[in-house]
């Protein structure tokens, strides 16, 4: 039950995280005009990964896409790449994890297969989250560098008579969305990996064979120490419908064609 809950929660957390990464990538407010010195402005600038926008105090907003690929800063291209890789990995991870969910039955898929898929999706979520966090952090670093550079030469002009106010940019909402979303995807991935450990049948998946001795009804299960001492993934004698590994009581109660009497 705990495994299913962990896996389900991991899936949901990752789903929210990836939705957040997609939202952050599409958002226009990666960097916003710094309003520290002038909280009320007639022209407000903000920029995203794909376009820059200007909101006038009149209420009109004008957005212009970056219609060049080669003319864009390498860092911006890198951030775009990281976010897209994060989204793609996350999307594939979600697809894989849907089939890996313990609560979803697909044919006669074995637990080992589900465990492998859970681990795969978990790793994908972790990498996806790291990509998003890295992308957002690279952009944030770029902003900080540019902020202090523009602060250093805030006003430029001839003899101080004519002033050109350089627009400074600070962190936009998308950065915080990206950081949180990346973190959630990462946490979801870790939860999936933890769930994988609980899903994986830890003993070798041989058919259980019961030997009916004359006096006692004892089932011998190959698998060594873990099987005999009650450790491993199936200590609660749960029914596992996978056609192979069975619990001791199940083998005893329901003799099948695999039993040798």
């Amino acid at each position: 039950m705990a495994v299913t809950a962990c896996q389900g929660l991991g899936f949901v957390v990752s789903l929210i995280g990836i939705a957040g990464i997609i939202a952050a990538t599409c958002m226009d407010q990666w960097s916003t005009q710094d309003l520290y010195n002038n909280p009320v402005t007639a022209v407000f600038n903000y920029q995203g990964l794909w376009r820059s926008c200007v909101r006038e105090s009149s209420g009109f907003t004008e957005c212009r896409g970056y219609f060049t690929l080669l003319g864009l800063p390498a860092m911006l291209q890198a951030v775009r790449a990281l976010m897209i890789v994060g989204i793609v990995l996350g999307a594939i991870g979600l697809l894989v994890s849907i089939f890996a969910l313990k609560c979803i039955r697909i044919g006669s898929m074995e637990d080992s297969a589900k465990a492998n898929m859970t681990l795969t999706s978990g790793i994908m979520f972790i990498v996806s989250g790291l990509c998003a966090i890295a992308g957002v952090s690279v952009f944030a670093n770029m902003l900080v560098t540019n902020f202090w550079m523009s602060t250093a030469n805030m006003y430029t002009g001839m003899g101080g008579m004519v002033q050109t106010v350089q627009t400074r940019y600070t962190f936009g909402a998308a950065l915080f969305v990206g950081w949180v979303a990346g973190g959630l995807t990462l946490i979801g991935g870790v939860m999936m990996c933890i769930a994988c450990r609980g899903l994986a049948p830890e003993e070798t998946n041989y058919k259980a064979v019961s030997y009916h001795a004359s006096g006692h009804s004892v089932a011998y299960k190959p698998g060594g120490f873990k099987a005999s001492t009650g450790f491993g993934s199936n200590t609660k004698n749960k029914k596992i419908y996978d056609g192979g590994a069975r619990t001791e009581d199940e083998v005893q109660s329901y003799p099948s064609k695999h039993d040798y009497v």
Partner: antibody, heavy 118, light 113 residues
Framework: EIQLQQSGAELVKPGASVKISCKAS????????MNWVRQSHGKSLEWIGN????????TYNHKFKGKATLTVDKSSSTAYMQLISLTSEDSAVYYC???????????WGQGTLVTVSA | DIVMTQSPSSLTVTAGEKVTMSCKSS????????????LTWYQQKPGQPPKLLLY???TRESGVPDRFTGSGSGTDFTLTISSVQAEDLAVYYC?????????FGSGTKLEIK
């Protein structure tokens, strides 16, 4: 057709206050800020401030803070400007104007003449 | 506050002539975000409210004759009337629309001979 209809001329005594109205029609009143501009006789134009009718939040020219108070009544699509502690310096034509692209003022009221005289 | 300086304060021309008037701002009105200059030109005829001619320094408002053209960037702007008509007799104002408080120039009075 967008129209801004201002209240009639006012003759007031020094130290008194006056409230000018500007009724908007032909557009959704809450969509655009309303600006107020002053023009003293034979002089240039001075921007007093503007108000966002949706939130009722004003922005003032620091020169007119404490002199002008901007308000709106959404139900009647009317903007108001109250001027207090009037002096002869405040005698002018007061215009309301709404916003357009580029923060320009494409539509203007006909103006309200305020005369401050003892 | 941004100071807007217009010149000349008045000019007298004959109908059909080309006329130019200047407007200078104490700070750049060019917004880096969209590369637009937040300068507006108005025409005010006697006894009337101002009428919007051009915004973003050079974009003509609808209904404005194409003889009115605006140019310039940053701090220096020009309004040109290619062929002055009798109905162009008015005072022309430039306005800073870039930062609060919005400020107007002192105006250029256009008179027809």
């Amino acid at each position: 057709e967008i129209q801004l209809q201002q209240s009639g001329a006012e003759l007031v005594k020094p130290g008194a206050s006056v409230k000018i109205s500007c009724k908007a029609s032909g557009y959704s009143f809450t969509d655009y800020h309303m600006n107020w501009v002053r023009q003293s006789h034979g002089k240039s134009l001075e921007w007093i401030g503007n108000i966002d009718p949706y939130y009722g939040s004003p922005t003032y020219n620091h020169k007119f803070k404490g002199k002008a108070t901007l308000t709106v009544d959404k139900s009647s699509s009317t903007a108001y400007m109250q001027l207090i502690s009037l002096t002869s310096e405040d005698s002018a034509v007061y215009y309301c104007a709404n916003y357009g692209r580029g923060n320009s003022f494409p539509y203007w009221g006909q103006g309200t003449l305020v005369t401050v005289s003892a | 506050d941004i100071v807007m300086t217009q010149s000349p304060s008045s000019l007298t021309v004959t109908a059909g002539e080309k006329v130019t008037m200047s407007c200078k701002s104490s700070q750049s009105l060019l917004n880096s975000g969209n590369q637009r200059n937040y300068l507006t030109w108005y025409q005010q005829k006697p006894g009337q409210p101002p009428k919007l001619l051009l915004y973003w320094a050079s974009t003509r408002e609808s209904g404005v004759p194409d003889r009115f053209t605006g140019s310039g960037s940053g701090t220096d702007f020009t309004l040109t009337i290619s062929s002055v008509q009798a109905e162009d007799l008015a005072v022309y104002y430039c306005q800073n629309d870039y930062s609060f408080p919005f400020t107007f120039g002192s105006g250029t009075k256009l008179e027809i001979k």
